[in-house]
Amino acid sequence: LRPSRVYKPEGNTKRALTLKDILNGTFSYKTYFPNWISEQEYLHQSEDDNIVFYNIETRESYIILSNSTMKSVNATDYGLSPDRQFVYLESDYSKLWRYSYTATYYIYDLQNGEFVRGYELPRPIQYLCWSPVGSKLAYVYQNNIYLKQRPGDPPFQITYTGRENRIFNGIPDWVYEEEMLATKYALWWSPDGKFLAYVEFNDSDIPIIAYSYYGDGQYPRTINIPYPKAGAKNPVVRVFIVDTTYPHHVGPMEVPVPEMIASSDYYFSWLTWVSSERVCLQWLKRVQNVSVLSICDFREDWHAWECPKNQEHVEESRTGWAGGFFVSTPAFSQDATSYYKIFSDKDGYKHIHYIKDTVENAIQITSGKWEAIYIFRVTQDSLFYSSNEFEGYPGRRNIYRISIGNSPPSKKCVTCHLRKERCQYYTASFSYKAKYYALVCYGPGLPISTLHDGRTDQEIQVLEENKELENSLRNIQLPKVEIKKLKDGGLTFWYKMILPPQFDRSKKYPLLIQVYGGPCSQSVKSVFAVNWITYLASKEGIVIALVDGRGTAFQGDKFLHAVYRKLGVYEVEDQLTAVRKFIEMGFIDEERIAIWGWSYGGYVSSLALASGTGLFKCGIAVAPVSSWEYYASIYSERFMGLPTKDDNLEHYKNSTVMARAEYFRNVDYLLIHGTADDNVHFQNSAQIAKALVNAQVDFQAMWYSDQNHGISSGRSQNHLYTHMTHFLKQCFSLSD
């Protein structure tokens, strides 16, 4: 037996973080996002659950909805109708998948100071929203869409085709929710509330994933989800638009699919209303390197939607897939014809382009060896966007304003110099026409949310500065965080290193690599966090490193598309390269190096452990993908193509974790998975375990009954992190 090694932070009255701190969420931070209801007014839910109205200009504030009203129905969320006459209150939240949930909705009448009783909403509802004007309600119940002209009116049923697990109207099926839309809804009101666009997903021919949910009963339940894995039959999508003024006169009208898309399997990717009678739809070929943006107009004479060929804009990638993780959405100008959009420039960096007529004639608005990330708002004279340009750090986000009214347009960084040390990673929330906006800074210092004037960018007030958190952290020994880059051959890899308090370069420390590494992801970000790895550095004296290898985002397509059609190769290689570089730094104990990851990170950590390099003593994979054939079609095929002989079956087969089972012989491997994982099915870990058993390789495993991909129930999460901590401490010979 090795002597146990105990890390003791030296002579300091401050205490180290404990695992309990992390599990209890003792050091969680707050952000403040105004719920904008006009150009200068917003709502916010106070600490004591009152819904408070604020007017920035008059400095007026009052309770619009009392906590007693919220409490009377156990409401956890709310939504004010645009005419400000009603509020929906959401309760009985019941999570389904990543974004979707069902809930009970109550309508409170602000005019009359009471709940609306006539024609109550059914329960549970899958999605509900107000029209952008007035107080019409659209909602989805049992996979069908309903409309109410006023909350107290009888509902009008718009669709009748809805059927559980077969046809979904106005809400996405599993794969569209997770991999394409990233929302719980698939319906969109026109700006004036006249039209309602929605998608119908037909999953009738999709294979079913079935797994047991054990619950408390004598017999387990079986959960059935239409889930297309790589190469399987996909949902059939159709987009319809209904006139909500006269829904009974003319039924929903189907929007035509562009010919070049409809000729083979395709996806709907997003819908953007341009004006009250103009809509923009985005489509994607199943082989996701061709995207078509189609602008359609309402023809009153035909009572139909027309999408002329000259209003089709094609975006194609020759080096990988179209877009980043998703294809970007357009930000239309006031003229309702031209738009701004982020896509790759000739050098392979994602930048803002202005499209007036054709994509070929697009005017590039931003350029450089960095990337534009998101367009927040386009107004008459300004365009607000975020990028990682400042000082060349890919893991930062600053907000910029381009004055498009000027010729040539001038660019200003709104956030770069505000709180330079504390704030390097921002997002923003704008009022309707950007008269005011809130900045939310996520770090690297303590998060802070501030309110700003949209004309001058002057700070008006601090909305949330996490003073309590600052005070409670005063007596905590936090680790030191460094973000740097390392070079290997012609490649540059950014990494984040979390160093124990009183770190001493002349000493040797155990190293834990935390990896995700999925295409278009980013782990090395300048954000504040107090989590499990912070604890491991603070209390257990472990050096933590996160490395963004090839395939990760915001550093150009050459770096991003390097993994195209060959997942599981360079992501792993680059983690190994980084580990070797860290060893060269001289403070890493080569005998005590571990790697861990979750989901895609579980896949990479498994492959790294099975790389046969002898670099790692041990590692953990939580809910890992083990074969791309087991994962969702939209995701797997985006990066790997199809698992067919004439496409990419060979790499599908040799990129599995199972294919490397023999190589786990000389490492300590902890495999963890939730049995009710709807996303990365338990099947993935079951197959790894089977292969390891067949190869007579010893390993450790833990399953979490009835837990999904997040293993997030309080008890399970506590057990998980405690278990992983014991495993790591044992691996690193750290005493309990």
């Epitope: 007693s68 100071g113 009471e114």
Partner: antibody, heavy 124, light 113 residues
């Protein structure tokens, strides 16, 4: 004690407008909505509309929409009802009444106190 | 709109006798989630504003004598005055406050026989 005191009787010509006030006292003004109800000779009571003093949002009976305007002055604890384009059939006694705001889901209240009434006569 | 219909239109009753007034609504006033009926009864004397007697169909407003009682559920309701006193001769209105617009019955006049 609770009181709703209305302005005095009015005689108006057809096509004119009338504005009736209702001053509240003896209770917290913002805890109740104010409603307007009229009673034409020999007719049933007819609800015209109401207003929530907390946000000034009015709610009108569709029958009167476009002709009626209900407002509130919270600082004076007073509500107003203005009816325009008067016709002879608008001749009635106009009452204001209070109705408690229902903060809780199980609540819902009747109109428990009424003003003394204002006679509006429309005659050429 | 919910239509409220009272019967009879008028009622002649002797002092000390029982008076029963009926009220029917065109749709149910029973709220399933709290099992309450959103119906009120008012008394109106000449030259005076209406006075609240009963709410929730059967709950007496404070200060209202116990000879007044309300009953019924859903769409059919009754106001009963068990022993008429001289001051009870008036017009009685039912009113629904289940949904907007608020609506009243046409009234029932209780006269001395």
């Amino acid at each position: 004690q609770v009181q709703l005191v209305q302005s005095g009787a009015e005689v108006k010509k057809p096509g004119a407008s009338v504005k009736v006030s209702c001053k509240a006292s003896g209770y917290t003004f913002t805890e109740y909505t104010i409603h307007w109800v009229r009673q034409a000779p020999g007719q049933r009571l007819e609800w015209i509309g109401g207003i929530n003093p907390n946000n000034g949002i009015p709610n009108y009976n569709q029958k009167f929409k476009g002709r009626v305007t209900i407002t509130v002055d919270t600082s004076a604890s007073t509500a107003y009802m203005e009816l325009s384009s008067l016709r002879s059939e608008d001749t009635a006694v106009y009452y204001c009444a209070r109705r408690r705001i229902a903060y809780g889901y199980d609540e819902g209240h009747a109109m428990d106190y009424w003003g003394q009434g204002t006679l509006v006569t429309v005659s050429s | 709109d919910i239509v409220m219909t009272q019967s009879p239109d008028s009622l002649a009753v002797s002092l000390g006798e029982r008076a029963t007034i009926n009220c029917k609504s065109s749709q149910s006033l029973l709220y399933s989630r709290n099992q309450k009926n959103y119906l009120a009864w008012y008394q109106q004397k000449p030259g005076q504003p209406p006075k609240l007697l009963i709410f929730w169909a059967s709950t007496r407003e404070s200060g209202v004598p116990d000879r007044f009682s309300g009953s019924g559920s859903g769409t059919d309701f009754t106001l009963t005055i068990s022993r008429l006193e001289p001051e009870d001769f008036a017009v009685y209105y039912c009113q629904q406050y289940y949904s907007y617009p608020l609506t009243f019955g046409q009234g029932t006049k209780v006269e001395i026989k």
